[in-house]
Interface confidence: low
């Protein structure tokens, strides 16, 4: 089965620059299929723009100005690229790549879409680092004791643009866990968002990862925030003892950033 | 020119109660085209649901039914038993791939119909309320309540900033909510919730040594441990790939 990945979830440009949007095809040989590009402007219908067929023929939708869009494919990397020249406000949109995928039954085809890349045009000069800054929250003892479950919360702040994807996995597992999230909120010139994961008691002793995709992540890789295992046999103190006032009772965390 | 027009811009549905989306074709006979349905969820993922010829996307056949009403020139998509996973924008689209005549392999889309999912009407359920802290950041977690109307207050004398709460449907078909804030005195922050004309406090759920039943530690358990606010990391974590965390008590 064909699968399309658009590694950039967003692409931020200033006016008149050139944007290059990538689409990686897997499961199908790119030189044996046509790749289509669609655009969804805010509040408008999704519209076909341009396609490149298996033999390299390019077809543009009528009414699309010539010279605006360029499409090509690189068989070696199984990638199709949509280049948007001289970006302007009316190019603000989400761009999807797509292809027709044959089904097992003869004559049945479906068109599958990539996850889309949002083109953002800005005139702001932003701080050098507008990647998401994480803060982690571990389950409260009350929740783990009373509900035999625990909630991890991953807070991400001070990022730009607003396009962000968050998912959760257990360490050493590729299964995406069912999580919940708040809306992305604007704070001054940047954005914040949080996501939370509730796991049953039996999973609290496993390490969990909050995985964040954002245009401005360092080195362009997904950021992984590690949530350490929780010991559920940790027991109660006299509630009158306020451990936060007594350094001997608190847990100190040495936090070391290790890029990999 | 051909146009696909959804019947509604927004369709609220209840969990488990069938819902029907309709999309009419203007300017052409719907029978001359193949109709497709897609769903766009949070994060812009466009997922194929249905195409004429009884083709369904993976995982859609059991809970979705596509149909064409030739007489009314419209396409119909039925969600047989909606769940919270079905929230999103639904698009009808048409093509003439393989129909002969003008070979159009592009899709022509209609505007989306936003499907919002609400829990079924059910007995009222009081929330559980828990506080989570890290540095100046405080999160109030409100779990498993119904109905939706709720006011969440983080109680502090030294507020830096607060954010609007996120209220979502829980996997069990009730609501969960989280409210975040930043406070100079985060250690002393508690959370109180107004729901269904009652007030629920996070302190109601704190584990006490003299509590009874399932809260009481078993005799085999160690009885000395940090209090609930002590197993929170104190620092903000800035990571790229790995956190090396060493714990010292």
């Amino acid at each position: 089965a064909g699968h399309l990945e658009q590694p950039q979830i967003s692409s931020t440009k200033t006016l008149s620059k050139t944007a290059r949007l990538e689409c990686v095809v897997s499961g199908i040989t790119i030189s044996a299929t046509s790749v289509y590009w669609y655009r969804e402007r805010p509040g408008e219908v999704i519209q076909f723009l341009v396609s490149i067929s298996y033999d390299g023929t390019v077809r543009k939708e009528s009414g699309i100005p010539s010279g605006k869009f360029e499409v090509d494919r690189i068989p070696e990397t199984s990638t199709s690229t949509l280049t948007i020249h001289n970006v302007e406000k009316q190019d603000i949109a989400t761009y999807y790549c797509a292809l027709w995928e044959a089904q097992q039954e003869l004559g049945k085809k479906i068109k599958v879409f990539g996850p889309g890349t949002k083109l953002i045009i800005t005139d702001k000069q932003l701080d050098a680092d507008v990647s998401p800054k994480p803060t982690i929250f571990l389950p409260s003892i009350a929740e783990t004791k009373l509900q035999k479950a625990g909630t991890y919360l991953c807070l991400l702040e001070k990022f730009f643009p607003d396009v962000i994807k968050i998912h959760w996995q257990e360490k050493k597992s590729n299964t995406i866990l069912g999580s919940q999230e708040g809306n992305t909120m604007k704070t001054n010139d940047t954005y914040m968002k949080f996501s939370w994961l509730t796991v049953p008691e039996k999973s609290l002793d496993k390490e969990h990862r909050c995985i964040v995709r954002h245009e401005n992540n360092k080195n362009g890789v997904d950021q992984e925030i590690i949530f350490p295992p929780i010991k559920t046999d940790v027991i109660t103190m006299d509630p009158k003892d306020n451990c936060s006032k007594d350094a001997n009772d608190t847990l100190l965390l040495q936090l070391t950033n290790t890029s990999a | 020119a051909i146009e696909l027009v959804p019947e509604h811009q927004t369709v609220p549905v209840s969990i488990g109660v069938p819902a029907t989306l309709r999309c009419s074709m203007k300017g052409e006979a719907i029978g001359n085209y193949y109709i497709n349905w897609y769903r766009k969820t949070q994060g812009n993922t466009m997922t194929f649901i249905y195409r004429e010829k009884d083709i369904y996307g993976p995982g859609f056949k059991d809970n979705f039914q596509g149909d064409i009403d030739i007489a009314k020139n419209l396409a119909v998509l039925k969600i047989l038993a909606p769940s919270e996973r079905d929230e999103g924008s639904y698009y009808c689209a048409c093509d003439t791939l393989g129909m002969g005549g003008e070979y159009t392999d592009k899709l022509i889309f209609g505007k989306g119909t936003r499907v919002t999912v609400e829990p079924r009407s059910q007995p009222h359920t009081k929330p559980s309320v828990f506080v989570m802290k890290n540095g100046t950041n405080v999160a109030c977690l409100v779990k498993e309540f119904y109905p939706k109307d709720i006011r969440i207050n983080l109680v502090s004398s030294k507020k830096i900033t607060e954010f609007d709460p996120a209220i979502v449907i829980s996997p069990s078909g009730k609501y969960n909510a989280v409210k975040l804030g930043k406070y100079e005195d985060s250690n002393s922050v508690t959370c109180s919730v107004q729901h269904d004309n009652k007030t629920v406090h996070s302190t109601d759920f704190e584990v006490k040594t003299d509590s009874t039943d399932h809260v009481k530690p078993k005799e085999t358990e160690n009885t000395k441990q940090p209090s609930k606010s002590c197993h929170k990391p104190k620092a903000i974590v800035h990571t790229e790939k790995v956190n090396m965390m060493s714990l010292t008590v």
């Epitope: - | 209840s14 109660v17 039914q65 009403d69 119909v76 047989l80 079924r120 009407s121």
Partner: antibody
Framework: QVQLVQSGAEVKKPGSSVKVSCKAS????????INWVRQAPGQGLEWMGG????????NYAQKFQDRVTITADKSTNTAYMELSSLRSEDTAVFYC??????????????WGQGTLVTVSS | DIVMTQTPLSSPVTLGQPASISCRSS???????????LSWLQQRPGQPPRLLIY???NRFSGVPDRFSGSGAGTDFTLNISRVEADDVGVYYC?????????FGGGTKVEIK
């Protein structure tokens, strides 16, 4: 326009069975409930049971449970009601009716023309 | 089973005058999903029944606005604001909240 067309009138002997058909056209057959309703001469309406073809399983009124079988053929958009062990008091007009937009719960929005079954020795 | 009781059994009315039919259920018709699945049907002489009102008060497509439904819980009413000759027939209430689906005994509307 949705239409439900039923098979013709039948005369049956006591103890025998009758199978009435109901062919749907002009709408989606699969996802609506097709119900069967009995109306004895000069009497009111009585629900016998119904089926949602998509799911394939039928629901029956207790009174008819042992004698009625409701089926659906998705390929021909046709529903069937078979009533066995007929007795004279089964003489009635049998209607098929489509449940509304959510299976059973709208009420019955479209009705067949009715099939008169006469049970007589 | 839910028993549906209609009153009156028969209602002679003058053309142009209003008519009202009552339907009472033996238990609440509020479904666990919050909806109330009570509908009204009209059966003209020699014809199959026809849906007028669904979910208490929603008029089915093509039904004149002189027909209206109201009620809640266990008590429901069908109103005809100005009776026309065409309205002669038997009117049934029906519940689809719980299996088995059940009908009222019917109310005959005739012209005086």
């Amino acid at each position: 326009q949705v239409q439900l067309v039923q098979s013709g009138a039948e005369v049956k002997k006591p103890g025998s069975s009758v199978k009435v058909s109901c062919k749907a056209s002009g709408g989606t057959f699969n996802i609506y409930a097709i119900n069967w309703v009995r109306q004895a001469p000069g009497q009111g309406l009585e629900w016998m049971g119904g089926i949602i073809p998509f799911f394939g399983t039928a629901n029956y009124a207790q009174k008819f449970q042992d004698r009625v079988t409701i089926t659906a053929d998705k390929s021909t958009n046709t529903a069937y009601m078979e009533l066995s062990s007929l007795r004279s008091e089964d003489t009635a007009v049998f209607y098929c009716a489509r449940g509304g937009d959510s299976g059973y719960d709208w009420g019955f929005d479209y009705w067949g023309q009715g099939t008169l079954v006469t049970v007589s020795s | 089973d839910i028993v549906m009781t209609q009153t009156p059994l028969s209602s002679p009315v003058t053309l142009g005058q209003p008519a009202s039919i009552s339907c009472r259920s033996s238990q609440s018709l509020v479904h666990s999903d919050g909806n109330t699945y009570l509908s009204w049907l009209q059966q003209r002489p020699g014809q199959p029944p026809r849906l007028l009102i669904y979910q208490i008060s929603n008029r089915f497509s093509g039904v004149p606005d002189r027909f209206s439904g109201s009620g809640a819980g266990t008590d429901f009413t069908l109103n005809i604001s100005r009776v026309e000759a065409d309205d002669v027939g038997v009117y049934y209430c029906m519940q689809a909240t719980q299996f088995p689906l059940t009908f009222g005994g019917g109310t005959k509307v005739e012209i005086k």
